[in-house]
């Protein structure tokens, strides 16, 4: 059964073209080809790694119930964001020895291509989504989610690992995009702000959101994560936008209320399984998705991102508990831990449902309007 | 791409020792590794595990009995301890691919070392 | 805690002949389970990982087969060199408790 969670409509953003390469060849007219924010050094868009071939044969899943209704990312309004203020600190970095994916932090040095080179590919995320520009695709279906209703045993662990707060999943969390297209969970986390400042990773027409939830996919078609790094459809995350709402959410609460025990960077709690399904969004059939990149070095191309339409809504205590308990290395609170928005470089943004309009807000510009590649063909 | 276990010798009960695994041709910053034991004429069994990024996991009835650590070449393992149940050949294995630790995956282990073997008595 | 049942514990066969290891782990572990083989004074070698992906240089003979909790290690075609003793390892996740076991080991002799 799931556990009651607040949410309202206003528009989220975030998808993938589900595709092998990216849809397109050049920048559309009124996508950003330039991050909102000033892009913390080393995560500059540059031209870089190729997606390599990557094969996905897997079983099918169930499809989840429906239940509650849900926010739209479309309906938000249009924001004008030319210039974000929201840019992440230096403060979150792992500080151990380690190669060099365990030496980066947000915003300053070293340069996340000299991390990793495939940060400065030419397809990374978070984008900007703009629903308008969106292609519908119908051929996207509601996703399929089995077995994310965990029991009390065997526990999980919690662990503030310097740039975020991140859950291990057991095996047997199965998550399929479309026949064929099928996932085990490995991990869960979160990106957010600080008071008074949003922290998601992805935004909407510029607008960003308080927090963003991230739960990170294997394909089936691949033993091991480094196996699927950089193959196209080998890792897929779903991602959700958190917002302030009225209520306390009590799943998030199941997470949030053990903050404090890993306040330091490093340490690590066990929390009881729990509904992980009840963290995302209820509605699993209005998304957007496109292909890009982790969000973190080794920034791997090729990852399919799904962004739920549908916002999830915790209380103002709650975002302030998430965003203000942790520490990063040294005295550097745990905050504004996301990434720049990188240019799309030509891709295309598909919607599982009809998100844009006939005209774009944005008279001076020309429309475009996008079409599907059938994500499952 | 090798692994080597050396330390292994005779001790008294009670008497810590610690066996060092020698790692070359990789960098334990991007391949996680698990050390293993086996009881004469006995099974394989897990001890314990430490992530690239250096944190440890061990076995319930490990947990005290061992401690892991590591420097940029080598993991040891330390029986802080040790009783005449702790006889045994010691094994230490490489995960068999590059591990991220933000993600938590794990399916074998390979190379494995020769082994070194532990003998506790009095 | 994740436990592996290893059966049978031990087997003879004849060159040539079939061999069908089983192994049940406690709880669901997808298709983390590995095959060893170990020979005398030997570490174990890694036959198969993914329940069913067959390590390199390892003959086409081994097959790994199974998802969930049960598993299966057939050896068809079998030689004198494969007489050893055969573990699984099933990988729950190393950041859970007891979440790596292996397998109480099949002797395998060849007639």
């Known amino acids: 059964q799931r556990l009651p969670r607040m949410q309202e409509d206003s528009p989220l953003g975030g998808g993938s073209s589900g595709e092998d390469d990216p849809l397109g060849e050049e920048d559309l007219p009124s996508e950003e080809d330039s991050p909102r924010e000033e892009d913390p050094p080393g995560e500059e868009d540059l031209p870089g790694e190729e997606d390599l071939p990557g094969e996905e044969d897997l079983p099918e899943v169930k499809p989840k119930s429906e239940e509650e209704g849900s926010l739209k990312l479309e309906d938000l309004p249009t924001v004008e964001a030319p210039g974000d203020p929201q840019e992440p600190q230096n403060n979150a970095h792992r500080d151990k020895e380690g190669d060099d994916q365990s030496h980066w932090r947000y915003g300053g040095d070293p340069p996340w291509p000299r991390v990793s080179p495939a940060c400065a590919g030419r397809f990374q995320s978070p984008v900007d989504i703009r629903p308008q520009l969106a292609a519908f695709c119908p051929a996207l279906r509601p996703l399929e989610l089995l077995g994310f209703q965990l029991p009390p045993l065997p526990e999980l662990r919690l662990r503030n690992n310097g740039h975020s707060v991140q859950l291990t999943l057991p095996p047997g969390l199965e998550m399929a995009l479309g026949p064929g297209r099928e996932y085990r969970a490995l991990q869960l986390h979160l990106h957010w702000g600080a008071a008074g400042r949003p922290g998601s990773e992805h935004t909407v027409e510029g607008h960003r959101f308080p927090a963003e939830i991230h739960v990170v996919h294997l394909s089936t078609a691949f033993a091991r994560v480094d196996e699927a790094l950089g193959r196209p459809g080998g890792l897929a995350v779903l991602a959700a936008f958190l917002e302030e709402g009225p209520e306390e959410n009590s799943a998030y609460e199941q997470l949030l209320s053990r903050l404090e025990e890993i306040a330091e960077e490093g340490s690590e709690t066990q929390v009881p399984g729990l509904d992980i399904s009840a963290l995302l969004p209820s509605d699993f059939s209005r998304y957007f998705q496109y292909e890009g990149s982790l969000t973190t070095p080794p920034c791997a191309q090729g990852v399919i991102w799904t962004v739920f339409n549908q916002t999830v809504m915790l209380s103002a205590k709650q975002l302030h508990t998430l965003s203000d308990t942790l520490w990063g290395p040294g005295d550097s609170r745990l905050q504004l831990n996301f990434r720049a928005t990188q240019p799309l470089n030509g891709r295309v943004i598909e919607a599982s449902f009809p998100a844009g309009v006939d005209s774009s807000p944005r008279a001076a510009e020309p429309v475009q309007l996008n079409s599907c590649l059938a994500a499952g063909d | 791409q090798s692994v080597k276990e050396s330390g292994g010798r005779l001790v008294t009960p009670g008497t810590p020792l610690t066996l060092t695994c020698t790692v070359s041709?990789?960098?334990?910053?991007?391949?996680?590794m698990i050390w293993v034991r086996q009881a004469p004429g006995e099974g394989l069994e897990y001890i314990g595990f430490?992530?690239?990024?250096?944190t440890t996991y061990y076995a319930s009835w490990a947990k005290g009995r061992f401690t892991i650590s590591r420097t940029s070449t080598t993991v040891d393992l330390k029986l802080t301890r040790p009783t005449t149940e702790d006889t045994a050949t010691y094994f230490c294995?490489?995960?068999?691919?590059?591990?991220?630790?933000?993600?938590?995956?794990?399916?074998?282990?390979?190379?494995w070392g020769p082994g070194t073997l532990v003998t506790i008595s009095s | 805690e994740l436990v592996m049942t290893q059966t049978p514990s031990s087997v003879s066969a004849a060159v040539g002949g079939t061999v069908t290891i089983n192994c049940q782990a406690s709880?669901?572990?997808?298709?983390?389970l590995a095959w060893y083989q170990q020979k005398p004074g030997q570490p174990p070698k890694l036959l198969i990982y993914y329940a069913s992906t067959l390590a390199s240089g390892v003959p086409s003979r081994f097959k790994g087969s199974g998802s969930g909790t049960e598993f299966t290690l057939t050896i068809t075609g079998v030689q004198c060199d494969d007489a050893a003793t055969y573990y699984c390892?099933?990988?729950?996740?190393?950041?859970?408790?007891?979440?790596?076991?292996f397998g109480g080991g099949t002797e395998l002799e060849i007639k």
């Open positions: 430490i992530t690239t990024g250096g």
């Open positions: 041709g990789f960098s334990l910053n991007s391949y996680a």
């Open positions: 709880q669901s572990i997808s298709s983390y």
């Open positions: 294995a490489r995960d068999r691919v590059k591990s991220y630790d933000d993600y938590g995956d794990l399916d074998a282990f390979e190379p």
């Open positions: 390892l099933g990988v729950y996740g190393y950041s859970f408790d007891d979440g790596i076991a």
